[in-house]
Every structure is written in C-alpha cells, then in structure tokens.
C-alpha cells in the first residue's frame, strides 16, 4: 500500500486532512498530547479504518473502545474505505486520559479522495485500475513481473512528413495514438476539492527528453490531444473538476535504451495543498508509474521471413530473378531498390538491420540504419520507415567509422540456453579485432553500447578483423532445423574443402576445374589448388581464425559440435594479410525458412555435378532445407560480397514476449 502523509492532531483545535484511498496515513497522537495524560482511545466514522500497533512486538488491533498506553512505541495508522461526498465528512476522535484529569478530546476531520495513475502494469494490453494491489513504482522482469511498457514512436504515420512521429509534439491521428501507451488518471473527490488543491503531473528532469505525454481532451466530435510533458516541459498543472473524473494520457518514448539511459521513465502525479495563499504549496500525496522503453530486438534466420529487400544494379537481372523466385517460394513480399535510388550501392545487408519493438498493445518493425552511409544512405529513411515501420540509427553520420560498422557484421543467434541461462531471443553477434592495435578495426562504440543497452539479446563479440571486409556473415550463418536446438550453425571451413578436394583427387578427378564456365576467369585445377603451398598456408591461418570463433560460439551459445555444420570454403589472404573468399562464399547465404539462396561456388564439375554444391546439399537437405545456388559471381563475388550481403529480410517477431525474460 502506498505511503500517505503524517497527520499531527492537537486538542487545541480540530485538524483537517486529506486521505487518499489506498494509502496508509500515519497519525501522530503523541507530540501534542496533554502533559498529564498516559493513555488514549480512538473512535472513527464508519468510512475510516484505524490500526493501532504497540510494539515491539507489534500487537495489532482495529479500533474499539479500548485504551492504549500513550508512548512512542504505539503506531496509529489510518486508511479510508470510500471517497468523501463532501469536505471533512469523515471524523476521527482521539480521547486522552490521565489519572487526575478529565478526558481531553482531539478532533480530526478527514476528506477521503481517490487519486490513481493507472497504466498497463500487468502487461495485458489493457489499462486496469490497480489501486492498492500492486506497487507501480517498480518495474520487474519475468513472467511474474510487472511494470508498464513504452514504445519509441519512431515510425512515420504521416507520409507527407520526413520525420519520425516522435520528432513532433502533435498527435497525427488514431494510428499515431496506437503507437503510444495509455495512462489514465482517475479522481473521485468532493465537488469543491480542487479550489484548495491542485494536481501536477511531472517527470524527472533527467528523463524529460526521453518521453512525451499527450493529454486527451474529449470533445463532442473527436478527441484532441495536447502535449503536457516532454523535452521542454517537465511538469504540468492539471485542470481537474471535482467529483468522479477520468483523464486519459498517451505516452510515447523518444529514445531507446542506451549507455546514458537505462530505459526506465517514471511519471508522477502529485497532489498539492494550495489552501494557504501566503505559503508555498505543500505535497499531500504522490503516485507514480514506471515505464520501461521497449528494446529494439533482432530476429534470427530461424524466424519466418516476411519481406525480402535487394538492389537493382547494372546487369544483376539474373540475380534478381533468382531472389524473386526464392521469395515467391517462401511466400515473401519482395522490395527492390532501383538503381537511381541506390547509387550503385548494392549492399543491402550492410546498410540496415530490421528488428522490431513490442508492447503488449502493439508490435512495430523497426529498421536500424547503419552509419556506413554510402549509396543506400537514404533507403532506410525514405523507403523503409513509414506507417507502422520505425527507424533508429546510431554512430557518427559523417566519417569516423570502419567496415565493421556495416550490418553484414551484425547477426543474431536463434534462442539458446547456455549453462542454465536462457536467452529466449537469442544473442547478438558482431565482429571485432582480437586485440586493439593502431590499425585494427572495431564496431563503433556507439553501436556496441546501443546493442548492449537493449539488454534482451546479450551481445557476443566475435573475431572478424582477419577478413578483408571484416563481417561475421563471411564465415557464419544459421539455418532452421527440425531437431536438437531447432537450428544449425554453419561455419565456413577450409579444412572441409581441402578434404573434399583431396577425396576427388584420390578418385582421379585432379584435373577437374574450379571456375569452369566463367568467362574471363582463370580456371584452377583441383590438383593445382591442393599443391599450392601458399594457398594452403593462408587457409591454415583462416581455419585458426574460424576455429577461434567456433570455440567462442560453442561457449557463448551453449553449442555442441553436433550443432555445427562445416561448409567447404577456401579463402586467400590479400593485402595486409586480410582474407577474402577464393570462390563464392557459400556460407553467405539468404535464409528464407526452408529455402536457401546460396552463392553458386562454380566448383569442379564431377560426373555432371559441381562437387561443392553436391556436398552442401548432402549436409543441408537432410534437415528439410532446399538449396538454390545463385550465380552472383560478377555482380557480387568479385566486388567482395555475396548473396547475403546483397539482400535483407524482415522477419516475423518472436512469439516470446521480451518482458517475460530475465536478462
């Protein structure tokens, strides 16, 4: 039960006080008691409950005609059962007794009022009155947790605007309102109560730039909303009529959790006594609601795909046809960014990551725009953000970034349990250097901080700086599986490729050619690849780098070897000992449910079939996956990327609700 104020009573004159329903009010009967009195008794109106405890040990007893010793160990508390119809209509009488004096009476006139700030603290999608049931001032995680949730209103419901909805202090329409959380102020007071009292709604100065509150004013034709709290307004005096009244507020978050903002916002209503015009207003009561801003959540490859994105560039029609066919098979919407909009930047995966935010009443896809800002710079803002599609970005928008700030370097695992700790939304994975040096690359700290601050997908740093491009999607992917943990981790594996090529040579296929059928590309015989000492040394180094990540992933995702599939792949070390795929990098695949779009490796054709494709199919088809090999050689591979790099996917949000987890 909420804490009320302390009321001091005195025999000299009657005391007038306000008692808010659902609060426990302390009664100080000792400090002004007549000097010779040693005991007291209390009588109260039927609407007042008095509790007297004498401790220690506490002996609790409701009022009757009993007398109680007048000493500091006695605690008297009041609660009120009903709101008053008129000011001071509830009475408490204290009688003081002494051995030689007649009883002395002190009178207390109470006004019971109902004031409660309600939000969806039970996370059902509905605002229910919670007076005297739950403490709204704490926010707790887990299935038995409580606390209201706010969405960052980061979509753009007004298509004529270029800004996010939370960047203005207007409510566009009911669509805009649905992105906000409802909070209701319920009051029940005597009619004249607010001639001497005022209600003020307020937010801490440290949080005022993170939230905006609109007050709905009900008119005859429509509801209008006006801003009452926000970056410019930490407090607002409310005009409340006496009697029974409900006032609706709509609350939007303006910022995602981040290093400097844990994501909690407290809105408080204060009841002030303004009866004495010559004195400052006095606080009578406060009620608060704590909201947590919904985190931005990534979706892994195991979530069903809903929309595929790719770019149209010079001469990639065949690639787009393959992606279109795959999207149709997976029953996905397809969005193509035309040449005039992508400015020859085909790397859709690098520009953005599509996740979502969720409150009990609303789920919203949100695009996280990387700071790489090349040709696709405008695409997330102009073409992805829109009605019910949010937008967020982090990091410097001009310079100061590296290749590791592109979102091919940002992935998320499927849900895992690691040494008994559950990650029901998976864990974020991004690449880094293994130690900082003058020229090592790392994901920008602002991006790392943002990802960590979301709390629900605890990030894992992998080692990717050994790669020329430096992205984790160059050596790993996840595919859905019907057994075990519900997925497999795919890792690029030079060892597996050398083993396959050695087997083919042993069977007399040493003359078979890699890159056969590719015009203007020097073909390589299996035997030459196997005998090239430098290439073998390079791949031995690459294997060590991938193995480092393999052990890291096993430890941080709780994986066993049987959860991992090795995809045959060779790399070569280029300038500054940075690795690039030697042939199209098959692990850099597009995963659309059970349909996989895999870079066509152009491996040695043996008995009419590419041995690399055959090997990959033999590894993945038993999991119910269908492999489509897509020729991306000249349009993507030679430009240092593959199918995954050139595409992006919006996926279905998790059915698991983030607030039910314990980070």
């Amino acid at each position: 039960m909420a804490q009320g104020t302390l009321i001091r009573v005195t025999p000299e004159q009657p005391t007038h006080a306000v008692c808010v329903l659902g609060t426990l009010t302390q009664l100080d009967i000792c400090s002004s008691a007549p000097e010779d009195c040693t005991s007291f008794s209390i009588n109260a109106s039927p609407g007042v409950v008095v509790d007297i405890a004498h401790g220690p040990p506490a002996k609790k007893k409701s009022t009757g005609s009993s007398t109680w010793p007048l000493d500091p160990g006695v605690e008297v508390t009041l609660t009120m059962k009903v709101a008053s119809g008129s000011t001071g209509d509830q009475k408490v009488q204290i009688s003081y007794y002494g051995p030689k004096t007649p009883p002395v009476k002190a009178l207390l006139y109470l006004t019971g009022v109902e004031i409660s700030l309600c939000a969806d603290i039970t996370r059902t999608g509905k605002v229910k009155p919670t007076r005297a049931v739950k403490d709204q001032r704490t926010w707790t995680w887990g299935p038995c947790g409580q606390g209201a949730i706010l969405l960052v209103n980061c979509d753009r419901d007004n298509l004529e605007s270029s800004a996010m909805d939370c960047e203005d202090d207007e409510v566009l329409d009911s669509e805009d309102l649905q992105d906000m959380s409802l909070m209701t102020l319920s009051t029940k007071t005597p009619k004249d109560f607010f001639t001497n009292h005022t209600l003020v709604l307020h937010v801490a100065r440290s949080e005022m730039d993170k939230v905006r509150v609109f007050q709905a004013t009900r008119g005859k034709l429509s509801s209008k909303c006006s801003v009452v709290l926000g970056p410019k307004w930490p407090s607002h005096y409310l005009m409340v009529p006496g009697g029974k009244h409900n006032m609706d507020f709509y609350v939007e978050a303006l910022a995602f959790p981040d290093t400097d903002f844990p994501g909690l916002i407290t809105l408080t209503i204060s009841l002030l006594d303004t009866s004495n015009l010559e004195l400052p207003e006095a606080v009578v009561f406060q009620d608060s609601v704590v909201f947590r801003v919904a985190p931005w959540i990534m979706t892994p490859n195991t979530q069903p795909p809903q929309e595929v994105y790719a770019c149209s560039i010079f001469e990639n029609e065949d690639f787009l046809k393959s992606v279109t066919t795959l999207a149709m098979k997976a029953k996905c919407k397809l969005t193509i960014c035309p040449e005039e909009e992508n400015m020859d930047d085909q790397w859709m995966q690098d520009e953005m990551e599509i996740g979502y935010i969720q409150a009990p009443h609303k789920t919203l896809p949100v695009v996280f725009d990387s700071p790489r800002n090349r040709g696709l710079k405008e695409f997330p803002i102009k073409r992805v953000m829109g009605p019910d599609f949010g937008y967020v970005t982090r990091g410097p928008q001009t310079g100061g970034i590296s290749g590791l700030d592109s979102f091919g370097n940002l992935e998320v695992s499927p849900p895992v349990t690691v040494r008994g700790k559950e990650y029901p939304l998976g864990r974020i994975l991004f690449g880094d250097s293994c130690y900082p040096s003058n020229d090592s690359r790392q994901m920008h700290q602002a991006l790392q901080d943002f990802l960590s601050a979301q709390q629900v997908q605890a990030p894992v740093k992998l080692y990717s700086d050994w790669l020329s491009v430096g992205h984790v999607d160059e050596f790993l992917s996840f595919v859905p599986a019907p057994d075990r943990k519900g997925f497999r981790l795919l890792l690029a594996s030079p060892r597996s490729c050398y083993k396959l090529f050695q087997e083919q040579q042993n069977e007399g296929h040493g003359e078979a050619l890699l890159f056969e059928g590719i015009k203007k590309k020097k073909q390589q015989k299996i035997k030459n690849i196997l005998s090239n000492k430098t290439l073998r040394e390079h791949n031995s180094f690459v294997e060590r780098c991938i193995d480092w990540n393999r052990e890291l992933l096993k430890r941080e995702l709780g994986l066993a070897e049987s959860d991992i599939i090795d995809i045959p792949q060779l790399f070569k070390l280029k300038e500054f000992s940075k690795a690039e795929a030697f042939f199209p990098n098959m692990v850099n695949m597009l995963v659309l449910g059970k349909h996989l779009g895999i870079p066509k490796p152009f491996g040695p054709v043996i008995n009419g079939r590419c041995c690399l494709e055959e090997k990959v199919c033999s590894l993945l088809e038993p999991l119910g996956l269908q492999c489509t090999f897509i020729n991306d050689f000249f349009t993507y591979h030679i430009r240092h990327g593959e199918v995954h790099c050139g595409t992006n996917v919006r996926r279905k949000p998790f059915s698991f609700k983030w607030w039910n987890m314990v980070p």
């Epitope: 003058n438 020229d439 690359r441 070569k572 300038e575 940075k578 240092h640």
Partner: antibody
Framework: QVQLVESGGGLVKPGGSLRLSCAAS????????VSWIRQAPGKGLEWVSF????????YYADSVRGRFTISRDNAKNTVYLQMNSLRAEDTAVYYC?????????????????????WGRGTLVTVSS | QSALTQPRSVSGSPGQSVTISCTGT?????????VSWYQQHPGKAPKLIIY???ERPSGVPDRFSGSKSGNTASLTISGLQAEDEADYYC???????????FGGGTKLTVL
C-alpha cells in the same frame, strides 16, 4: 589503364585542415587499391596511407595516424585524404597512387604494397 | 632518417652496370617478398620499375633487375643509358606500425 589527378592542395596555417582529392579516369577506381605518398621539398618519398578496393579497411603511417583520414567514394571514382591538425612538417607534394586489385590471382600478389600508377601530385604548404 | 637504408649516390658510365642496395630488417625486407623500386626524374612523379623483389611491369626494359638476399634487396641496372640518370627509391611491406616503408633514395649519375 587508370589515370589519376590530385587536387585540393594549397597554403594552410598550422593547425588547419585540407581535403585532397584523387579523381580517376579511364577505369573504375573500385577495382584499385589506392595509396597516398608524399615528398617533402628536396627529400625522399614517404608512404602516408592506404585504402583497399572494397573500401573496408585503411592503414596509416605513424606520422599521420589520428590526424589524417583516407576515404573513397567509388560512385564518384574518387579517393580523399582529409588532413587535420596540419603541421609544418606535413609540407610536401602529395601523390595519389594505385594498383589494380586483380581478383584472378590464386594468392595475393602484394599489389597493395606497390604503386604502379601515380598522379602528378598536389603541393600542400603548411606555414603561418 | 628513413627506415630502409640506401646509398646516397651511385654513378656509372654508359654501358656499365650499377647496383643499388636497400637494407632493411627481419621485419620488412627480410620477411616479405614485397620489395619494389621506383625511378623518379626531377620534377616528375615516381614510376614503378620493379615489384615483388624481381618482377618488372610491362614497358620496363629488362636492363632493370631486382634481387634479395637476407635483409638486403638490390636493384641492378645494366647497360647504363643517359636517361637512367634519376633518383631511385626502394620500398617494402613491413611488420611495423607503418606498414609500407621507403628508403631515403639514391641519386644515380650517368657519367
């Protein structure tokens, strides 16, 4: 074969900034590694910075690290050198140079470490 | 002071051969086969004449040859001609924090 033209040099006070550009013609610069090399008046060559063809990593000489930034805009066929906190000892002719990133090699040929095409240079003078 | 050491000057008569040395350490010339040589005429941009220790770009006469032994690389110019008079610079990839190093340059005079 690619041709390179540097621009953006000039006189600047110590502590000031300049942005050099290296524009390519005759070929697509996205197929090339690019380096900046400088030569102080009457002195030898000094390697300054490097950016790979994929625009994914960069390297710098100790003498300029933290002050200079190399970048490229493949759509504009141009590489840039942003020079901040300039000092008198940065006075030099700045050359842009490149080497083709040939994807056909079975193993790395070291093209990022040599410069087979050079521009004519642009003079940067840092003086109060 | 340059990281790679070259003689300040060498000279030779037309038709003769000259060799210019370039001495580094185990962390650059000694470790990598990424040694290159450049020719620079006064007021002009440098021109690549040798890369990867001994390879010649197309258009460079075979009078120019490169080699390496231990931590020292060498450029040999045989059958000296008047137009060979220029400054010559060696360069190497390095393990140091500056990944490409140049020599201080050698002035070749054709007598």
């Amino acid at each position: 074969q690619v041709q390179l033209v540097e621009s953006g040099g000039g006189l600047v006070k110590p502590g000031g900034s300049l942005r050099l550009s290296c524009a390519a013609s005759g070929s697509t610069l996205s197929d090339y590694f690019v380096s900046w090399i400088r030569q102080a008046p009457g002195k030898g060559l000094e390697w300054v910075s490097f950016i790979n063809s994929a625009n994914t990593f960069t390297y710098y000489a100790d003498s300029v690290r933290g002050r200079f930034t190399i970048s490229r805009d493949n759509a504009k066929n141009t590489v840039y050198l942003q020079m901040n906190s300039l000092r008198a000892e940065d006075t030099a002719v700045y050359y842009c140079s490149s080497a083709n990133d040939d994807v056909d090699d079975i193993v790395a040929p070291g093209r990022g470490y040599y410069m087979d095409v050079w521009g004519r240079g642009t003079l940067v003078t840092v003086s109060s | 002071q340059s990281a790679l050491t070259q003689p300040r000057s060498v000279s030779g008569s037309p038709g003769q051969s000259v060799t210019i040395s370039c001495t580094g350490t185990r962390g650059d010339v000694g470790r990598y086969n990424h040694v290159s040589w450049y020719q620079q005429h006064p007021g002009k941009a440098p021109k690549l004449i040798i890369y990867n220790v001994y390879e010649r770009p197309s258009g460079v006469p075979d009078r120019f040859s490169g080699s390496k032994s231990g931590n020292t690389a060498s450029l040999t110019i045989s059958g000296l001609q008047a137009e060979d008079e220029a400054d010559y610079y060696c360069s190497s990839h390095s393990r140091s924090s500056t990944p490409v190093l140049f020599g201080g340059g050698t002035k070749l005079t054709v007598l």
